[in-house]
């Protein structure tokens, strides 16, 4: 890929909210399983960030499978628009403040903070580096601002709007959203390298989601998973380009894949996302 091939997708000054999942399994691909039944089910699509229909075979599969659209939405989506501004006097916290701390499925452990609803305090935990949920903050201060009760009777909401409990007026603050791993690519890019079950030693590449790079590994020739590419370029094309690089000042998103654009509506703004 040369620099000229790059496409620039312009978004508004407001940053695209990162994809933050309430449950790790919401990132799994739709899996129809090995059986042959034809059952209408729903799964959460991480590319469109919506619950969609798929045909389930009736056995096995994975947890990203729901009987109804409502159940899928309940488990895997959150209504951003309803959370941006809170105007009620009771100053309720964002719903994610009540989620259990979730290290996610990766193992690149880093220090993060979560709001402990039992102790009513923000506390430290170890985050694996990908997925998890929104009760996950880079700093203790950020966690306190968003989830703890403020000292003067106000609650700072998660998009930086401070609510004054006396007159219920809104005071804008610096916009800061909990900054998790921003995953916009295929779910298998998050899986670890898997040699498989045979005895060959083939040179392959896998995407290391913790460091954000494609790395070589030895493939046994059978089994394994889909995080397995014959060249570094193929690996980068499939996985690296699926991770949208967030640039806070310029409001630019660079993506290198030249594919047909698909318009996706995300909460309060429209952006262009590439088809994978």
């Amino acid at each position: 890929d040369s620099e000229e091939d790059e496409e620039h997708t312009i978004i508004t000054d407001t940053e695209l909210p990162p994809l933050k999942l309430m449950h790790s399994f919401c990132a799994f691909k739709a899996d129809d399983g090995p059986c042959k039944a034809i059952m209408k089910r729903f799964f959460f699509n991480i590319f469109t960030r919506q619950c969609e229909e798929f045909i389930y075979g009736g056995c096995e599969g994975n947890q990203n499978r729901f009987e109804s659209l409502e159940e899928c939405k309940k488990m895997c989506t959150r209504d951003n628009a309803n959370r941006i501004i809170k105007t009620t006097l009771q100053q309720e916290k964002p719903d994610f403040c009540f989620l259990e701390e979730d290290p996610g499925i990766c193992r690149g452990y880093i220090t993060r903070y979560f709001y402990n609803n039992q102790t009513k305090q923000c506390e430290r935990f170890k985050y694996g580096g990908c997925l998890g949920n929104m009760n996950n903050f880079e700093t203790l201060e950020e966690c306190k601002n968003i989830c703890e009760d403020g000292p003067n009777g106000f609650q700072v909401d998660n998009y930086g709007t401070q609510l004054n409990a006396v007159n219920n007026s809104l005071t804008p603050q610096s916009t800061k959203v909990p900054s998790l791993f921003e995953f916009h690519g295929p779910s298998w890019c998050l899986t670890p390298a898997d040699r498989g079950l045979c005895r060959a030693n083939e040179n392959r590449f896998y995407y290391n989601s913790v460091i954000g790079k494609c790395r070589p590994f030895k493939y046994s020739g059978c089994g394994g998973n889909e995080n397995n590419f014959t060249s570094k370029q193929e690996c980068l094309r499939a996985c690296k380009k699926g991770f949208i690089q967030r640039i806070s000042k310029g409001g630019l998103i660079k993506t290198k894949r030249k594919r047909k654009k698909q318009r996706v509506k995300i909460a309060y703004e429209e952006i262009f996302v590439k088809n994978m």
Partner: antibody
Framework: EVQLVESGGGLVKSGGSLRLSCAAS????????MSWVRQAPGKGLEWVGT????????YYADSVQGRFTISRDNAKNSLYLQMNSLRAEDTAVYYC???????????WGQGTLVTVSS | DVVMTQTPLSLPVTLGQPASISCKSS???????????LNWLQQRPGQSPKRLIY???KLDSGVPDRFTGSGSGTDFTLKISRVEAEDVGVYYC?????????FGQGTKVEIK
């Protein structure tokens, strides 16, 4: 007063299984992540694993990953360690410990001895 | 994994005299949040471990002030200003900055 009392240790053959329990009292159990740490005879301490406050997520040391499972029952103020495919090198005193708000172990139980014979 | 190295492994001391234990880590224990998660445990003979010091220098409640912790980065020290009979036991440093948590080999403090 914070109290952690382990039980369930004993002698088991290599390849066998054992389930340890830790009864907690003197604090709001569900508010704290909990850990297991072990100490082989005459040796130092080794972290085994940790479970989150609600019990939905766990962390494990590489040496026990896939063989040991940590769980908890917040209604019973109890922490568990299910140990499968036991090896001689798993012989140790197993301690449960509470994780404080800094994600550091602050209180420890008295331990329970697990002996794996080959 | 982070390797924690304690010296000395055995420390015979005279009652009323000071004692010092060194703990070195194979990489810095300064975390991204600006805190250093280095801790000290005391294990008296036949007893379970008890936390003495956390975050390098903070004493747990009920710990006598003759114990002090210091250090930064990779080098840390536990000092006992005047050793008493009840201080006999094994002292462990351990780090909670990086996963997995790792412990030093322990320093056995005994009375001469």
């Amino acid at each position: 007063e914070v109290q952690l009392v382990e039980s369930g240790g004993g002698l088991v053959k290599s390849g066998g299984s054992l389930r340890l329990s830790c009864a907690a009292s003197g604090f709001t159990f569900s508010s704290y992540a909990m850990s297991w740490v072990r100490q082989a005879p005459g040796k130092g301490l080794e972290w085994v694993g940790t479970i989150t406050t609600g019990g939905s997520y766990t962390y494990y040391a590489d040496s026990v990953q896939g063989r040991f499972t940590i769980s908890r029952d917040n209604a019973k103020n109890s922490l568990y360690l299910q140990m499968n495919s036991l090896r001689a090198e798993d012989t140790a005193v197993y301690y449960c410990a509470r994780q404080d708000g800094n994600f550091l172990m602050d209180y420890w139980g008295q331990g329970t001895l697990v002996t794996v014979s080959s | 994994d982070v390797v924690m190295t304690q010296t000395p492994l055995s420390l015979p001391v005279t009652l009323g005299q000071p004692a010092s234990i060194s703990c070195k880590s194979s990489q810095s224990l300064l975390d991204t949040d600006g805190k250093t998660y280095l801790n000290w445990l005391q294990q008296r003979p036949g007893q379970s471990p008890k936390r003495l010091i956390y975050l390098v220098s903070k004493l747990d409640s009920g710990v006598p002030d003759r114990f002090t912790g210091s250090g930064s980065g990779t080098d840390f020290t536990l000092k006992i200003s005047r050793v008493e009979a009840e201080d006999v036991g094994v002292y462990y440093c351990w780090q909670g900055t990086h996963f997995p948590f790792t412990f030093g080999q322990g320093t056995k403090v005994e009375i001469k």
